[in-house]
């Protein structure tokens, strides 16, 4: 398991315009866990990173992920309700130069090494769908969310807004 060194453990405003022409409005270093309090961990295996969903032992340190938050304008012609709206998008980086990516063909979530500007597959629309939990919707595939399947992260299609509170797409962010 690994974390990110040298990043402040609180949110900070940034002045960095290098990512797709927009700067993150803030960044936040946090551990990611499921609704049922299993930890999301990252391990280097055979020169590639694997993502696991597991119960940690009592004093085992949680892996941290750097979440970068971006504000995105959503044009009224896409929003369907005739008004321009704003939404929050995030990228998630568990270690330097690696970001979570949505692989829509394989319905999988993968860690890819890439340079900025990041591809759209690395961006997720942030949802607060349940008290103090968040969900991550693929920018490239609306209605598809990061979720938990067989102790791994996977992409899960959510058919209706009533299913947005389903536990397997809910995550908790914690600084500890």
């Amino acid at each position: 398991a690994f974390g990110i060194s040298g990043v402040q453990k609180y949110t900070r405003a940034l002045h960095d315009s290098s990512i797709t022409g927009i700067s993150p409005i803030t960044e936040y270093l946090a551990s990611l866990s499921t609704y049922n309090d299993q930890s999301i961990t990252f391990a280097l295996e055979d020169e590639s990173y694997e993502i696991y969903v597991e119960d940690l032992k009592k004093d085992e340190k949680k892996d941290k992920v750097l979440l970068s938050y971006y504000e995105s304008q959503h044009p009224s012609n896409e929003s369907g309700d005739g008004v321009d709206g704003k939404m929050l998008m995030v990228t998630l980086s568990p270690t330097k130069d690696f970001w979570l990516h949505a692989n829509n063909k394989e319905h999988s979530v993968e860690l890819h090494k890439c340079e900025k500007p990041l591809p759209d597959q690395a961006f997720f629309v942030l949802h607060n769908m349940h008290s103090n939990c968040v969900s991550f919707e693929c920018k490239t595939d609306p209605g598809v969310f990061i979720g938990v399947k067989d102790n791994h992260l996977a992409l899960i299609k959510v058919d209706s807004s009533e299913n947005l509170c389903t536990e397997n797409i809910l995550f908790k962010l914690s600084e500890t």
């Epitope: 405003a13 309700d81 704003k86 949802h127 769908m129 349940h130 919707e137 947005l164």
Partner: antibody, heavy 121, light 106 residues
Framework: QVQLKESGPGLVAPSHSLSITCNVS????????VHWIRQIPGRGLDWLGV???????GYNSALMSRLSISKDSSKSQVFLKMNDLRTDDTAVYFC???????????????WGQGTLVTVSA | DIQMTQSPASQSASLGESVTITCLAS??????LAWYRQQPGKSPQLLIY???RLADGVPSRFSGSGSGTEFSFKINNLQAEDFVSYYC?????????FGGGTRLEM
């Protein structure tokens, strides 16, 4: 154009219940959360609760047992119901909309004009 | 629940001056803090969100700073319409609590 408008009973007797309707237009309740906030005359703001875009609710811990929030999406209405009213529930009640789609992190740009509810015998 | 402690409760200032209001959160809230202005008999107006972002149409004499647990809000070059009440609110976690407010007096 985004609008929220509260309509309430004005006067409620102690121990009775309060129902306020928030009529919204210019946006979809499936995309934005709607919150209820109240302000006792001459005092500060109290957050009461939220109905999130996905349908889940969150409430003020101290008032949770007396509050419920629901919606009728087909009529673009959000409802606040509060039971067992006391005189110190006298306040202006506001409904407000999230700034961001799907998320409350951005605060509240759009507010209703508020409806004054007086609890008195 | 997260407690928000806003200070001062009231402050006197003159036209053209600058004032600063602070808000302390009882636990870390990242950058998820908003500042509102409220004129008497009116609904509050969002001025700053995400701790530092100016809401649409808000003059640049308003600014916000801070992260974690300590936040501040500054008004430069005070105008007559600024002598009203101001509130902070944390939006990191439900319940989304407000500070007690600051009344700005001339």
């Amino acid at each position: 154009q985004v609008q929220l408008k509260e309509s309430g009973p004005g006067l409620v007797a102690p121990s009775h219940s309060l129902s306020i309707t928030c009529n919204v237009s210019g946006f979809s309740l499936s995309k934005y959360g709607v919150h209820w906030i109240r302000q006792i005359p001459g005092r500060g703001l109290d957050w009461l609760g939220v109905l999130r875009a996905g349908g889940s609710t969150g409430y003020n811990s101290a008032l949770m047992s007396r509050l419920s929030i629901s919606k009728d999406s087909s009529k673009s209405q959000v409802f606040l119901k509060m039971n067992d009213l006391r005189t110190d529930d006298t306040a202006v009640y506001f409904c407000v909309r999230d700034h961001y789609y799907y998320s409350s992190y951005g605060g509240f740009v759009y507010w209703g004009q508020g409806t004054l509810v007086t609890v008195s015998a | 629940d997260i407690q928000m402690t806003q200070s001062p409760a009231s402050q006197s200032a003159s036209l053209g001056e600058s004032v600063t209001i602070t808000c302390l959160a009882s636990q870390t809230i990242g950058a998820w803090l908003a500042w509102y202005r409220q004129q008497p008999g009116k609904s509050p107006q969002l001025l700053i969100y995400a701790a530092t972002r100016l809401a649409d149409g808000v003059p640049s004499r308003f600014s916000g700073s801070g992260s974690g647990t300590e936040f501040s809000f500054k008004i430069n070059n005070l105008q007559a319409e600024d002598f009203v009440s101001y509130y902070c609110q944390q939006l990191d976690s439900s319940p989304y609590t407000f500070g007690g407010g600051t009344r700005l007096e001339m």
